[in-house]
């Protein structure tokens, strides 16, 4: 009897460890995507950035999907979303089309069930990048806590994409799940 | 028999509470370090900031180590890292060496096993701090989600360190563990 | 005997699921509050923003309270706090009182037991918004990890409130609990 109870207890402990481990890992999707600058569009208009790395350098993804330039949620939950976008210009790249710039980022959520797109977060600045200086740089950081449903898609739009800094430490966005939806 | 089973159950519940509590606390290292401005260097070069508070005011640390100016990871995991850096200048401090400034922060990771240093995040802006204005201020915020291994070190580099705002609410960096590595 | 043990095991599993679920949800308060621009004060001085949405659009709250313009902590813990504040001006709104602006945000903590207010985080920039440009924009982001006690209150102060961007994706602040206090 006592031996049997111990076996049952071991089962309880074992199954709990499994359950705890499994639920813990399942409950925490994440992604950190870094810019893939081989295909940066030109112009000063607002564009959706579709080329991101998800598996090299600092870039990584787990329990989420990256497809068609969008970060797809696989698991309902509350997530912390963030983006860091750096813009830069050097005189050796040629003159700017205008010295007055609007350097912006928009983090958007698209629901494919009800096709619609909404901006979750925005940030940026108007800048006067004068020809008196040979080099210009500016970074934007945004972050916030959002309810995301499975199948929803997160994407990044920026103005003046040709001015993006292509370094992985400069231009990136990401998400990590903090908690379930009640 | 029934009493014995209840005792076993209590043991299961008790050990689980202990295990859950222990694993929960062990699994969540964090740090929030605020600038110690007693010894800020002069110059406009990039410098690694080595003086930070870890146990006064808003500064705190748990299950991580602060040593030799670096935040040392004691536990493998995925962490959210962040930094907020404020620069300021008042004309009463004397003239700036130049009105054109590059105000930058770099969050770096150093691996001591294979001595190497890599920038995880960067941010900042080029600024024109004209003599027409008596006071200038600028803040940078960066944040991101990174895999860190035990023994790796996080440090902060800034340009123009003499312009740092020494307040604990202005210049700080930190980290908190979000999840284990699978 | 064996049936009784299985029943006990089911109880253990069941109570554990309850306990795990309950503790998990209880342990994770959060809030994401977006600006309510129907009542934005004028002037360039520093003011506490008291009008925020907590239950429409992206705004949400759980296990925290929003009252009298402040986010009230209901549960001791370590929280990640963040704020994103956007300022903008278009010439159609009329001339600025001055072209030299100090656009700032302060995230403050108030303890009601010992009436006192302290700034946890600050950010911003001095800006020269010249009349040469018809539109100006600037965003600030701050974030950090803080120990908060039940009853403490978080509020947002900004300079130049009349320049705030009233969009929910632009001007918001929030918090989520990361871990218990040991």
């Amino acid at each position: 009897g006592s031996q049997h109870i111990r076996a049952e207890k071991a089962m309880v402990d074992g199954s709990w460890l499994d359950l705890a481990k499994r639920s813990k890992l399942e409950a925490q999707p994440f992604a950190h995507l870094t810019i893939n600058a081989t295909d940066i569009p030109s112009g000063s208009h607002k564009v959706s950035l579709s080329s991101w790395y998800h598996d090299r350098g600092w870039a990584k993804i787990s329990n989420m999907t990256f497809s068609n330039g969008k970060l797809i949620v696989n698991q309902d939950g509350f997530y912390y979303l963030y983006a860091n976008i750096c813009f830069r210009h050097h005189e050796t790249s040629g003159d700017l089309a205008t010295e007055y710039l609007q350097l912006m980022v928009y983090v958007t959520k698209t629901s494919i069930k009800i096709p619609s797109s909404h901006t979750l977060m925005k940030g940026g600045s108007t800048k006067y990048w004068s020809g008196n200086s040979e080099f210009h740089f500016y970074s934007i950081n945004v972050g916030g806590f959002f309810k995301l449903r499975s199948g929803e898609e997160i994407s990044i739009e920026v103005s003046n994409p040709s001015l993006l800094d292509p370094d992985q430490d400069a231009t990136y966005f990401g998400a990590f799940k903090v908690r379930d939806i009640d | 028999g029934s009493q014995h089973i209840r005792a076993e159950k209590a043991m299961v519940d008790g050990s689980w509470l202990d295990l859950a509590k222990r694993s929960k606390l062990e699994a969540q290292p964090f740090a929030h370090l605020t600038i110690n401005a007693t010894d800020i260097p002069s110059g406009s070069h990039k410098v690694s900031l080595s003086s930070w508070y870890h146990d006064r005011g808003w500064a705190k640390i748990s299950n991580m180590t602060f040593s030799n100016g670096k935040l040392i990871v004691n536990q493998d995991g995925f962490y959210y890292l962040y930094a907020n850096i404020c620069f300021r200048h008042h004309e009463t401090s004397g003239d700036l060496a130049t009105e054109y400034l590059q105000l930058m922060v770099y969050v770096t990771k150093t691996s001591i096993k294979i001595p190497s240093s890599h920038t995880l995040m960067k941010g900042g802006s080029t600024k024109y701090w004209s003599g027409n204005s008596e006071f200038h201020f600028y803040s940078i915020n960066v944040g991101g989600f990174f895999k860190l291994r035990s023994g790796e070190e996080i440090s902060i580099e800034v340009s123009n360190p003499s312009l740092l705002d020494p307040d604990q609410d202005a210049t700080y960096f930190g980290a908190f563990k979000v999840r284990d590595i699978d | 005997g064996s049936q009784h043990i299985r029943a006990e095991k089911a109880m253990v599993d069941g109570s554990w699921l309850d306990l795990a679920k309950r503790s998990k949800l209880e342990a994770q308060p959060f809030a994401h509050l977006t600006i309510n621009a129907t009542d934005i004060p004028s002037g360039s001085h520093k003011v506490s923003l008291s009008s925020w949405y907590h239950d429409r659009g992206w705004a949400k709250i759980s296990n925290m309270t929003f009252s009298n313009g402040k986010l009230i902590v209901n549960q001791d813990g370590f929280y990640y706090l963040y704020a994103n504040i956007c300022f903008r001006h278009h010439e159609t709104s009329g001339d600025l009182a001055t072209e030299y602006l100090q656009l700032m945000v302060y995230v403050t903590k108030t303890s009601i037991k010992i009436p006192s207010s302290h700034t946890l985080m600050k950010g911003g920039s001095t800006k020269y918004w010249s009349g040469n440009s018809e539109f100006h924009f600037y965003s600030i982001n701050v974030g950090g990890f803080f120990k908060l006690r039940s009853g403490e209150e978080i509020s947002i102060e900004v300079s130049n409130p009349s320049l705030l961007d009233p969009d929910q994706d632009a001007t918001y602040f929030g918090a989520f609990k990361v871990r218990d206090i040991d």
């Epitope: 050097h90 200086s133 | 260097p41 406009s44 070069h45 990039k46 080595s50 400034l101 | -």
Partner: antibody, heavy 116, light 108 residues
């Protein structure tokens, strides 16, 4: 690469300008340092310049030495009131990415001889 | 800030280990570099940020230290290591010289 030029024999009191010419990298995201070495002696830092043409000098060099950016690829070192003690090989060195403790690219140096 | 190097000269046998010390008059954190210079040549960067091996530097060379005390170690000494070694603080411009006085390494 970096290359120094302008070194020559001069008499005491004569002013002299040395030029550092860079290629393959930007002056605006790197420091340019001037360092000198008297015959048989150690290295002596003079100063640096970086973005925005902000120049910083060793305490002893302030006033008599001036570092300036003269084009997108050249940095000058102007020296006045030269004395015999200024006889040295003058090096130009890049501080990688504005790192000052990472002078990773040095020129071969240009010799300045001050003699009456 | 004053940088002081000891000893000089220092001798080491082929295959042995040589240690050079550098002391800063006040804390410079980890903002320190080491250079090797041979006669008639410009200095060559070996170590930066006190312990990071520079590109092209041999892995036999290592750096350590923090604050005011720093060490350069050359293990498995070779004849090619005969040179003068300099430490350099990269912390503050408020200095007369950012370099130490140099340490000559003689290989026997």
């Amino acid at each position: 690469s970096v290359e120094e030029s302008g070194g020559r024999l001069v008499t005491p009191g004569t002013p002299l300008t040395l030029t550092c010419t860079v290629s393959g990298f930007s002056l605006y995201t790197n420091l340019i340092n001037w360092v000198r070495q008297a015959p048989g002696k150690g290295l002596e830092w003079i100063g640096y310049i970086n973005y925005g043409a902000s120049a910083y000098y060793a305490n002893w060099a302030k006033g008599r030495f001036t570092i300036s950016q003269t084009s997108s690829t050249t940095v000058d070192l102007k020296m006045t009131s030269l004395t015999i003690e200024d006889t040295a090989t003058y090096f130009c060195a890049r501080g990688y990415g504005n790192d000052w403790d990472r002078l990773d690219l040095w020129g071969q140096g240009t010799l300045v001889t001050v003699s009456s | 800030i004053v940088m002081t190097q000891t000893p000089s000269p220092v001798s080491g046998a082929v295959g042995g280990t040589v240690t050079i010390n550098c002391q800063a008059s006040q804390s410079i954190g980890s903002n320190l570099a080491w250079y090797q210079q041979k006669p008639g040549q410009p200095p060559k960067l070996l170590i930066y940020s006190a312990s990071i091996l520079a590109s092209g530097a041999p892995s036999r060379v290592s750096g350590s230290g923090y604050g005011t005390e720093f060490t350069l170690t050359i293990s498995g000494v070779q004849c090619a290591d005969a040179a003068t070694y300099y430490c350099q603080q990269g912390y503050t411009t408020n200095a007369d010289n950012i370099f130490g006085g140099g340490t000559e390494v003689v290989v026997e």
